[in-house]
């Protein structure tokens, strides 16, 4: 089951103390079979797993990538996972720490000389091999933040959304990522229906900015699900 | 100031049903993940139900599977669990959690940051 395979995503944040003020951040704390909190005037515990379910990697953290924790799957369920350090065994770049890459299917590091060159190749080669889908290339895929001194401009490549500027998110445009804006309200967005449709997109849209969400466009309604049109909308 | 209220709790006989809603407020902040996790007197705080930002990855407790649904409303900010089949084991106060982040904020690993106070569920057998 879920439970017993997954140990990576052990308390994330923790919850107030009982009668305590809700709304406050939590700290994240190592794992540990029960994690004792200050609650009201004694300690209480939460357990120390708490899956985090996601359809993206940039769902997750910085530190983590999106993808079924067995290899089955648990019909359909997502949850963010700790990303594998160097020399681990990898499918995509988003499953390597910040600061590696997949190559050959395994983390290496991103080294400034070596990078581009490799990435490049890497690209390549998934494009131009039928098994290999685009989603094989990645769907958090941007430069590790640690290369470059400047966030990245709109139009920069990157791996992850952390590489570029603020009010930017990393997408996918044809077969490599660059930043592009994040969507305003009335812009036209992606709601991904099925799990893993995301992989299909050649040009990846952001998603919605601050205080909105991806919905119908009230007037299309009537139309068929397929035609629906969505767009970033106000809470 | 964020708030989250969690409300439909109560007293249910065994093999009946309720429905929690948790409705969050205040703050200006993409809700990203939201889920339900309830305590037992005596008992660790366990994770009940969790949603992804865009309602395609749901995960449960086994405990739960095919008695729970957990679903969300983004247009109202709202996460509900709709509880079937009701069991004595079930008695516990349920509270909710979300992950709130500001515009293009990403943690190093991603978690569960504002919390509701809760609302008590009894099941008497």
């Known amino acids: 089951t879920l439970n017993s395979v997954l140990n990576s995503n052990a308390i994330k944040n923790l919850p107030p103390p009982l009668g305590g003020a809700a709304g406050h951040p939590g700290s994240a704390v190592s794992a540990a079979p029960g994690i004792l909190y200050p609650g009201g005037n004694k300690y209480q515990t939460i357990d120390n797993y708490q899956p985090y379910p996601c359809a993206e990697d940039e769902e997750c953290g910085t530190d983590e990538y999106c993808a079924s924790p067995t290899r089955g799957g648990d019909a359909g369920v997502q949850i963010c996972l700790a990303c594998r350090k160097r020399r681990k065994r990898c499918m995509r770049h988003a499953m390597c720490c910040p600061g590696n890459y997949c190559k050959n299917g395994i983390c290496v590091s991103s080294d400034q000389n070596h990078f581009r060159g490799e990435i490049e190749e890497t690209i390549t080669e998934s494009f131009g091999n039928d098994h290999s889908t685009l989603d094989g290339y990645s769907r958090r895929t941007t430069l590790s933040s640690k290369m470059y001194h400047t966030k990245g401009q709109e139009g920069s490549v990157c791996l992850r959304s952390s590489d570029c500027a603020s009010g930017l998110c990393c997408a996918r445009h044809f077969w490599s990522k660059i930043c592009k804006p994040v969507l305003k309200e009335g812009q036209v967005c992606t709601k991904h229906r099925r799990k893993g449709s995301h992989g299909l997109e050649i040009f990846q849209r952001c998603y919605c900015g601050e205080g909105l969400s991806c919905r119908i466009q009230k007037d299309h309604h009537q139309a068929s699900n397929s035609s629906r049109l969505h767009t970033c909308q106000r809470h | 100031e964020v708030q989250l209220v969690e409300s439909g709790g109560g007293l249910v006989q065994a093999g009946g049903s309720l429905r929690l809603s948790c409705v969050v407020s205040g703050g200006t902040f993409s809700v990203y993940a939201m889920g339900w996790f309830r305590q037992a007197p005596g008992k660790l705080r366990e994770i009940v139900a969790a949603i992804s930002r865009t309602g395609s990855s749901i995960y449960y407790a086994d405990s739960v599977k095919g008695r729970f649904t957990i679903s969300r409303d983004d247009a109202k900010k709202t996460v509900y669990l709709q509880m079937n089949s009701l069991k004595s084991e079930d008695t516990a106060v349920y509270y909710c959690?979300?992950?709130?982040?500001?515009?293009?904020?990403?943690?190093?690993?991603?978690?569960?940051?504002?919390w509701g106070q809760g609302t008590q569920v009894t099941v008497s057998s």
């Open positions: 959690a979300v992950d709130g982040r500001a515009n293009g904020e990403r943690p190093a690993v991603a978690g569960y940051n504002y």
